[in-house]
């Protein structure tokens, strides 16, 4: 079901449309939901999840994260400086979001369906926001070798880095979520 | 099968400090969101702080920021909640608990309970 | 900050009747909301989440329904192990904020 149109929801009559942060909330939900269907299958196929290796791939990894800083957290809440991080991190997310396309077999479609949710969710963040100045969009060239060097990895390293992405992308999109609420 | 124990409860003074623990066992505690949660004698539950998995992201009842902290080992399985300049009003069970969730479900929960551990602020 | 208000907060009834609690949130939690079952002496219980989603080992004589604003907790036949005291919560936004109680008990 695509986002918006909750299944419970389609009968019922005279339906307020959506505000724009119930569409975002929405969003973000509706992408929580195919990243879990995504791990569901990493973590079938591996035992990446219960793995305590995560540190040595994850140093070669540069996955987004909030910080106290941000003023995403309950503790030092700033609105503005949040929506800056929020889509700064998910503008950076992009990279590692077309790495996971061809790392799905069973669930390639649900890939597609969270890079293209994704880009529809930063579109609108983007509307929501008044700074834009702020806001740094990653430079191609570098994303280009980046993908390069990812894919370039042995199998065990892919398997860990795609669950490290799906793991960190979750985190981030919980936290984003649970600070587009306090807005 | 998943386990939650808490330790560390007892009797302070007003103003005193206890430092709660909660061991985990049964499931990978990294994966899962944690929650306190305190219930003073003869009265209904209150939601008292969450610690997120990785992010470090945490939060507090009003009621208690500033005062308390919550924090985790995922090494150790183990969740703490840190009880700073207690009050009379702090009395209560304090129950550790899971949040739904892991790797599938993103709506929020608890699923797993402790036993609970008594916290008693009296001179 | 968004207040929960549970009502009834005492609910006098007989074996077999359905029963119904209301959980009001002051504004929108779409449908972030969890019911819990906790009897005398004993830890509370996860009946339902996501305000309608029953969780796994809970018997189907309940149901959760709502979204938005006005929440409902169902027993359908009630039995004698369901007399207890029933709170709602709200994982929406922070400070997460239980509802007061409702205690089922018999007439």
């Known amino acids: 079901v695509p986002p918006g149109e909750d299944s419970k929801d389609v009968a019922a009559p005279h339906r307020q449309p959506l505000t724009s942060s119930e569409r975002i909330d929405k969003q973000i939900r509706y992408i929580l939901d195919g990243i879990s269907a995504l791990r569901k299958e990493t973590c079938n196929k591996s035992n990446m999840c219960e793995s305590s290796k995560e540190a040595l791939a994850e140093n070669n990894l540069n996955l987004p994260k909030m910080a106290e800083k941000d003023g995403c957290f309950q503790s030092g809440f700033n609105e503005e400086t949040c929506l800056v991080k929020i889509i700064t991190g998910l503008l950076e997310f992009e990279v590692y979001l077309e790495y996971l396309q061809n790392r799905f077999e069973s669930s390639e479609e649900q890939a597609r369906a969270v890079q293209m949710s994704t880009k529809v969710l930063i579109q609108f963040l983007q509307k929501k926001a008044k700074n834009l100045d702020a806001i740094t969009t990653p430079d191609p060239t570098t994303n280009a070798s980046l993908l390069t060097k990812l894919q370039a990895q042995n199998q065990w390293l892919q398997d860990m880095t795609t669950h490290l992405i799906l793991r960190s992308f979750k985190e981030f999109l919980q936290s984003s979520l649970r600070a587009l609420r306090q807005m | 099968q998943v386990q939650l124990v808490e330790s560390g409860g007892g009797l302070v003074q007003p103003g005193g400090s206890l430092r709660l623990s909660c061991a985990a066992s049964?499931?990978?505690?990294?994966?899962?969101?944690m929650t306190w949660v305190r219930q003073a004698p003869g009265k209904g539950l209150e939601w008292v702080s969450s610690i997120y998995s990785f992010s470090g992201d945490t939060a507090y009842a009003d009621s208690v920021k500033g005062r308390f902290t919550i924090s985790r080992d995922n090494a150790k399985n183990t969740l703490y909640l840190q009880m700073n300049s207690l009050k009379s009003e702090d009395t209560a069970v304090y129950y550790c608990?899971?949040?739904?969730?892991?790797?599938?479900?993103?709506?929020?929960?608890?699923?797993?309970w402790g036993q609970g551990t008594q916290v008693t602020v009296s001179s | 900050d968004i207040q929960m208000t549970q009502s009834p907060s005492s609910l006098p009834t007989s074996l077999g009747d359905s029963v119904t609690i209301t959980c009001q949130a002051s504004?929108?939690?779409?449908?972030?909301l969890s019911w819990y079952q906790q009897k005398p002496g004993q830890t509370p219980k996860l009946l339902i989440y996501?305000?309608?989603r029953l969780q796994t080992g809970v018997p189907s004589r309940f149901s959760g329904r709502g979204s938005g604003t006005s929440f409902t907790l169902t027993i359908s036949g009630l039995e004698a192990e369901d007399l207890a005291t029933y709170y709602c919560?709200?994982?929406?936004?922070?400070?997460?904020?239980f509802g007061q109680g409702t205690k089922v008990e018999l007439k």
């Open positions: 049964g499931f990978t505690f990294s994966n899962y969101y």
């Open positions: 504004q929108s939690i779409s449908d972030e």
């Open positions: 919560l709200q994982g929406y936004s922070w400070p997460f904020m």
């Open positions: 608990t899971r949040n739904l969730g892991g790797v599938v479900v993103t709506t929020n929960g608890y699923d797993y």
């Open positions: 996501g305000a309608s």
